[in-house]
């Protein structure tokens, strides 16, 4: 009696299942009690000897390429062996590599988490993903895994992370790069400082007092609000960053606490209060202000 090994499909793609069947064309397996065993090269596969003439392999990989055969054994211990069958597992080269960001759009706030997600539309087997920073291509990380996506994480973004990034995927057919993705780091305003500027050391009534508010850090545009005893005096915008000024023509009512607030849409920060007091110098006829 002759024994044949049939693989279905005979030319599997990596990652797909394969069924091995041990066939005896001139014998019905019901005619006698048979035990079956499947081999690759010299190694027994699956459960070893079994009453089933079929062996299901859940996923075939490139390294599973090789020479397969089966054996059948009767109760009388007679062993039949099939011819060797070559099974070549086909690897799909990586294609359509893309890089996406979380949060989407590549805009991330300073201090927040940024994830660079590298994906391939096609590709099988062990795929090596590599992430690069800048046009020069500083290698940040590489990961090898059996999946179509992989992630590179920056837990707390800083200004130095504002760059162009790309990723490369490869599975043995040469590297395939993604397009460039630009990361913009949005910087919340730092606590501003309020400075009072008068035309002379001791400002007098009717002098013009300049309130200058400046946040050292923060993505533009920055909107500055000016306050006197928590009453809004007005606002000024700094389209390119930097500080902003608000002018006041002084009266006696302008004594008290002044503060300012900076806001660039990523949260507001209030300055410390600056106190302005009227003083009446001895022998002087007019009131004066000191801060």
């Amino acid at each position: 009696a002759e024994l044949f090994l049939i693989a279905s499909p005979s030319h599997p793609t990596e990652g797909s299942p394969v069924t091995l069947t041990c066939k005896m064309p001139f014998l019905q397996s019901s005619d006698a009690q048979f035990q079956f065993c499947f081999f690759r090269d010299t190694r027994a596969l699956g459960p070893g000897w079994s009453s089933s003439p079929k062996l299901q392999i859940a996923a075939m990989w490139k390294e599973d390429t090789g020479s397969y055969w089966c054996e059948a054994q009767t109760m009388a211990s007679k062993v039949l062996r099939s011819r060797r069958s070559q099974i070549n597992v086909h690897r799909v080269p990586v294609a359509d590599v893309s890089l996406e960001t979380q949060p989407p759009g590549g805009q991330v706030m300073e201090g927040d988490r940024l994830v660079l997600i590298c994906s391939v539309a096609m590709g099988t087997g062990d795929i090596t993903f590599l992430w690069y920073k800048g046009a020069v291509g500083l290698n940040l990380q590489s990961k090898t895994q059996r999946s179509l996506t992989a992630e590179y994480e920056i837990p707390s973004v800083r200004e130095s992370d504002a760059e162009q990034y790309y990723c490369v995927a490869e599975n043995g057919y040469g590297p395939s790069p993604s397009g460039l993705v630009s990361i913009t780091v949005r910087i919340p305003v730092s606590r501003p400082i309020l400075m009072l500027r008068a035309p002379r050391a001791q400002a007098a009534v009717e002098d013009v007092l300049e309130l200058h508010c400046e946040a050292l850090r923060g993505s533009p545009p920055i909107l500055y609000w000016f306050y006197h005893e928590d009453i809004t005096l007005g606002s000024r915008s700094a389209p390119s960053g930097g500080g902003a000024s608000f002018n006041l023509s002084l009266t006696e009512e302008h004594s008290g606490n002044y503060s300012c607030e900076a806001n660039n849409g990523l949260g507001a920060q209030r300055s410390e209060a600056v106190t302005l007091n009227f003083t009446v110098p001895t022998g002087a006829r007019s009131n004066h202000l000191t801060s």
Epitope: G111, S156, E159, P188, S190, L216, R217, G242, G243, G267
Partner: antibody, heavy 119, light 112 residues
Framework: EVRLVESGGRLVQPKGSLRLSCAVS????????MYWIRQAPGKGLEWVAR??????????YYADSVKDRFTISRDDSQSMLYLQMNNLKTEDTAMYYC??????????WGQGTTLTVSS | DIVMAQSPSSLAVSVGEKVTMSCKSS????????????LAWYQQKPGQSPNLLIY???SRESGVPDRFTGSGSGTDFTLTISSVQAEDLATYYC????????FGAGTKLDLK
């Protein structure tokens, strides 16, 4: 490799002037805010001046102790940072460092240049 | 200005010892926008420039040994060296960048 190399420090008389320079390489200079930070002999660290990038209109900031006396500037085409110091005082005597601002913390420092103000 | 107070001003330790140093700010350094503490730690060895160790109060700068750990939030912060090495003998400064930057006066680490 990131490098910041300061130069120009020397002995100057009170009320004199001096310009410090810092040559930068190894990173995209024009995208970062830069600082001058100083350290008086045996003392702690004190920020002196800051200049933002072109995107932020080259906005400048100064510590109260140097306001109206010091001017920070940059030349992005040459990757250079400068500090013009006028009306120098004895208390300006210090090691001056050129520093990269990375989200508020200072991740790269030069080796420093020494300014001594004395008669 | 935000005032940074470091303690102790100096500390004598043996190699292998665990050491902690404190930094307190006069105002909270926790930014409402991103819940990050705007505090950094630096190491300055004699005759050298300062070197960034920690940013965002607890994020270790690239290349810094993992024996250095930053912790704390709001106004109270700590730098811990889990097992001091001879090369760690230096002055350590904290710095806030919540507003215009200010540094602490430093903690000097010496060998016992």
């Amino acid at each position: 490799e990131v490098r910041l190399v300061e130069s120009g420090g020397r002995l100057v008389q009170p009320k004199g002037s001096l310009r410090l320079s810092c040559a930068v390489s190894g990173f995209t200079f024009n995208t970062y805010a830069m600082y001058w930070i100083r350290q008086a002999p045996g003392k702690g660290l004190e920020w002196v001046a800051r200049i933002r990038s072109k995107t932020n209109n080259f906005a400048t900031y100064y510590a109260d102790s140097v306001k109206d006396r010091f001017t920070i500037s940059r030349d992005d085409s040459q990757s250079m940072l400068y500090l013009q110091m006028n009306n120098l005082k004895t208390e300006d005597t210090a090691m001056y460092y050129c520093v990269r601002d990375n989200s508020g913390s200072f991740d790269y420092w030069g080796q420093g240049t020494t300014l001594t103000v004395s008669s | 200005d935000i005032v940074m107070a470091q303690s102790p001003s100096s500390l004598a330790v043996s190699v292998g010892e665990k050491v902690t140093m404190s930094c307190k700010s006069s105002q909270s350094l926790l930014h409402s926008s991103n819940q990050k503490n705007y505090l950094a730690w630096y190491q300055q060895k004699p005759g050298q420039s300062p070197n960034l160790l920690i940013y965002w109060a607890s994020s270790r700068e690239s290349g810094v040994p993992d024996r250095f750990t930053g912790s704390g939030s709001g106004t109270d912060f700590t730098l811990t060296i889990s097992s001091v090495q001879a090369e760690d003998l230096a002055t350590y400064y904290c710095q806030q960048y919540y507003s215009y930057p200010t540094f602490g006066a430093g903690t000097k680490l010496d060998l016992k």
